[in-house]
């Protein structure tokens, strides 16, 4: 058993049918010695008397808010949560496996640049009685500071019969140098509590591996005289690290017909312009990627050919 | 400690091309190592990230773009001094700080070259003959060093009398390639910045 926060405790259980569970001793936070009784949640049934209460915690029915009283007055509370270990593996019931980029990916994180700011998000089908708390650091043995905000519900989607809820959090490394070569990964730890179930999820990454630039901005077309060709131009996104000559991007320019089946023409360039043939009803899209370290491509920025 | 903006004219910078080749070569070699050594811990998540140049060179600090010198987090490291004459400095206006930067890059390349050659000698003794260093990558390191053209003492190739542990050598190769790829990215960024300045 360990303390998650004041008066909230996590009991780690080896979770299998007929498991013996864990013996837990609760102590009433009071100078009083006599006349103390214990109850669980809203029930008025007295579970025991005395300054300490010993309980065998086996299932969720044994978890909850234990309260010690004296003469009708509440003295203190202890909330017991359960953390299930199933055959040596901690349970992952609360969050959805996003399966990208690999199985057992519960937290996904992205950064728009090298400033040390990043966003993580996760999915769940649970809509109520759910709380998250997020901590982060650079490295784990001698951790350096990363400050995270509060996790917020960022999207709701309908997936088949189920509703899916997306939560996200923004974090910022306290003293980040955009040019630094990372040797210690960023660690992100999310505590999730659903009713009386506790779970924790972690992700470890280098900022360089989660970079996903914003799409190029100011995408414009300039028709070339007496030609079906157009000059496409764009600019670096505002959120990208500067100077751009140091933090350079490379670009992919795509001409896509109305029909998805039509052949796509693609051009790769390090410049912020390209000359392409603009077909009728086609659209031109441009996306960006770090020129030197191949992390994710940005989303496409698009303009119609007409 | 930082790169001045007034540096050689665009196109006058012979090292840019070599640094791009270097990044391509090390990335290809790393990809090959990850595929060939699939049953070894060779991915970025599995290896320890060690930098063999730590406390010996200070490339990131010495080559910091002028715009980042206002960022205190980028300025908290040691000073290191280097030999300062090189042929990539294709302009008389080049400052001492830029010379220090290019000299630091040269020292990096020299250190990695020695490590890779020593490692290759060990890998050639492996009866499994599972993986060797790409000669193209070694050649590209050499070409960039020649383009930088710094006078520096030659570092003798490390020779080892004990029987090599091939498992450990292959893991060390992965660690070295990951670190060298990261340094090659920094070198490419620096060369691109200097070329544009």
């Amino acid at each position: 058993i360990w303390e998650l926060k004041k008066d909230v405790y996590v009991v780690e259980l080896d979770w299998y049918p007929d498991a013996p569970g864990e013996m837990v001793v609760l102590t009433c936070d009071t100078p009083e010695e006599d006349g103390i009784t214990w109850t669980l949640d809203q029930s008025s049934e007295v579970l025991g008397s005395g300054k300490t209460l010993t309980i065998q915690v086996k299932e969720f029915g044994d978890a909850g808010q234990y309260t010690c009283h004296k003469g009708g007055e509440v003295l203190s509370h202890s909330l017991l949560l359960l953390h299930k270990k199933e055959d040596g593996i901690w349970s992952t019931d609360i969050l959805k496996d996003q399966k990208e980029p690999k199985n057992k990916t519960f937290l996904r994180c992205e950064a728009k640049n090298y400033s040390g700011r990043f966003t993580c998000w996760w999915l769940t089908t649970i809509s109520t009685d759910l709380t998250f708390s997020v901590k982060s650091s650079r490295g784990s043995s001698d951790p350096q500071g990363v400050t995270c905000g509060a996790a917020t519900l960022s999207a709701e989607r309908v997936r088949g019969d189920n509703k899916e809820y997306e939560y996200s959090v923004e974090c910022q490394e306290d003293s980040a140098c955009p040019a630094a070569e990372e040797s210690l990964p960023i660690e992100v730890m999310v505590d999730a509590v659903h009713k009386l179930k506790y779970e924790n999820y972690t992700s470890s990454f280098f900022i360089r591996d989660i970079i996903k630039p914003d799409p190029p901005k100011n995408l414009q077309l300039k028709p070339l005289k007496n030609s079906r060709q157009v000059e496409v131009s764009w600019e670096y996104p505002d959120t990208w690290s500067t100077p751009h000559s140091y933090f350079s991007l490379t670009f992919c320019v795509q001409v896509q017909g109305k029909s998805k089946r039509e052949k796509k023409d693609r051009v790769f360039t390090d410049k912020t312009s390209a000359t392409v043939i603009c077909r009728k009803n086609a659209s031109i899209s441009v996306r960006a990627q770090d020129r030197y370290y191949s992390s994710s491509w940005s989303e496409w920025a698009s303009v119609p050919c007409s | 400690r930082n790169l001045p903006v007034a540096t050689p004219d665009p196109g006058m910078f012979p090292c840019l091309h070599h640094s791009q080749n270097l990044l391509r070569a090390v990335s290809n070699m790393l990809q090959k190592a990850r595929q060939t050594l699939e049953f070894y811990p060779c991915t970025s998540e599995e290896i320890d990230h060690e930098d063999i140049t730590k406390d010996k060179t200070s490339t990131v600090e010495a080559c910091l773009p002028l715009e980042l010198t206002k960022n205190e987090s980028c300025l908290n490291s040691r000073e290191t001094s280097f030999i300062t004459n090189g042929s990539c400095l294709a302009s008389r206006k080049t400052s001492f700080m830029m010379a220090l930067c290019l000299s630091s890059i040269y020292e990096d390349l020299k250190m990695y070259q020695v490590e890779f050659k020593t490692m290759n000698a060990k890998l050639l003794m492996d009866p499994k003959r599972q993986i060797f260093l790409d000669q193209n990558m070694l050649a590209v390191i050499d070409e960039l060093m020649q383009a930088l053209n710094f006078n520096s003492e030659t570092v003798p190739q490390k020779s080892s009398l004990e029987e090599p542990d091939f498992y450990k050598t292959k893991i060390k190769l992965c660690i070295l390639l990951h670190a060298f790829r990261i340094r090659a990215v920094t070198i490419d960024r620096v060369m691109s910045y200097l070329n544009a300045s």
């Epitope: 979770w15 299998y16 498991a19 270990k85 055959d87 040596g88 593996i89 019931d93 199985n103 057992k104 | -």
Partner: antibody, heavy 115, light 111 residues
Framework: QVQLVQSGGGVVQPGRSLRLSCAAS????????MHWVRQAPGKGLEWVAF????????YYADSVKGRFTISRDNSKNTLYLQMKSLRAEDTAVYYC????????WGQGTMVTVSS | SYVLTQPPSVSGTPGQRVTISCSGG????????VKWYQQLPGTAPKLLIY???QRPSGVPDRFSGSKSGTSASLAITGVQAEDEADYYC????????????FGTGTKVTVL
């Protein structure tokens, strides 16, 4: 006392279907994940499928993916394995088992796929 | 399916120490716990060891398990006639409850 009682095995022709059941008692069935494991005659144990305690996630071995469906009815304390497009190589004793460090197994039920 | 490799058979005389190896990889034994089962002819497997080296109550202490790196082993110290059976190791792949992997099985013969 944890008990898993299996039923539904038998002889079936290739291409046909069969549904196995596993009735659980002596524990809170709705709190635990469940597995199906099989053993071909004279061969070793092969994991077949797993279902989470609430039925929200199901996982299958490649050899049965798309043909077998694991399901559960927590109100009836019963685990099921629906087997379709059966092949000769599916002939085996099928066991249901609880998920956890100390697991419990059913007695097994024989499925023979033969023409 | 992922398979853990065991020797097909091992044998020993009563009272001898018998060990069965179980070899896997980084994604299964290397990163998860190991179980061992005993299966007597015509019966369901019986759990002998869980969590690499833990014995459920009722399992004689002559059975012990251990794990090192990507391999595990089961030792029977002072093997007895009633230990003649098939033995299987089991783990998970990539910390994934939905991917139980079994060993190929070892027949223990008591001479």
């Amino acid at each position: 006392q944890v008990q898993l009682v299996q039923s539904g095995g038998g002889v079936v022709q290739p291409g046909r279907s069969l549904r196995l059941s596993c009735a659980a008692s002596g524990f809170t069935f709705s709190s635990y994940g469940m597995h199906w494991v099989r053993q071909a005659p004279g061969k070793g144990l092969e994991w077949v499928a797993f279902i989470r305690y609430d039925g929200s996630n199901k996982y299958y071995a490649d050899s049965v993916k798309g043909r077998f469906t694991i399901s559960r009815d927590n109100s009836k304390n019963t685990l099921y394995l629906q087997m379709k497009s059966l092949r000769a190589e599916d002939t085996a004793v099928y066991y249901c088992a609880t998920h956890g460090s100390q697991d419990n197994w059913g007695q097994g039920t024989m499925v023979t796929v033969s023409s | 399916s992922y398979v853990l490799t065991q020797p097909p058979s091992v044998s020993g005389t009563p009272g001898q120490r018998v060990t069965i190896s179980c070899s896997g990889g980084r994604s299964n034994i290397g990163s998860n716990t190991v179980k061992w089962y005993q299966q007597l002819p015509g019966t369901a497997p019986k759990l002998l060891i869980y969590g690499n080296d833990q014995r459920p109550s009722g399992v004689p202490d002559r059975f012990s398990g251990s794990k090192s790196g990507t391999s595990a082993s089961l030792a029977i110290t002072g093997v007895q006639a009633e230990d003649e059976a098939d033995y299987y190791c089991q783990s998970y792949d990539r910390g994934f409850t939905g991917s139980r992997v079994f060993g190929t099985g070892t027949k223990v013969t008591v001479l």
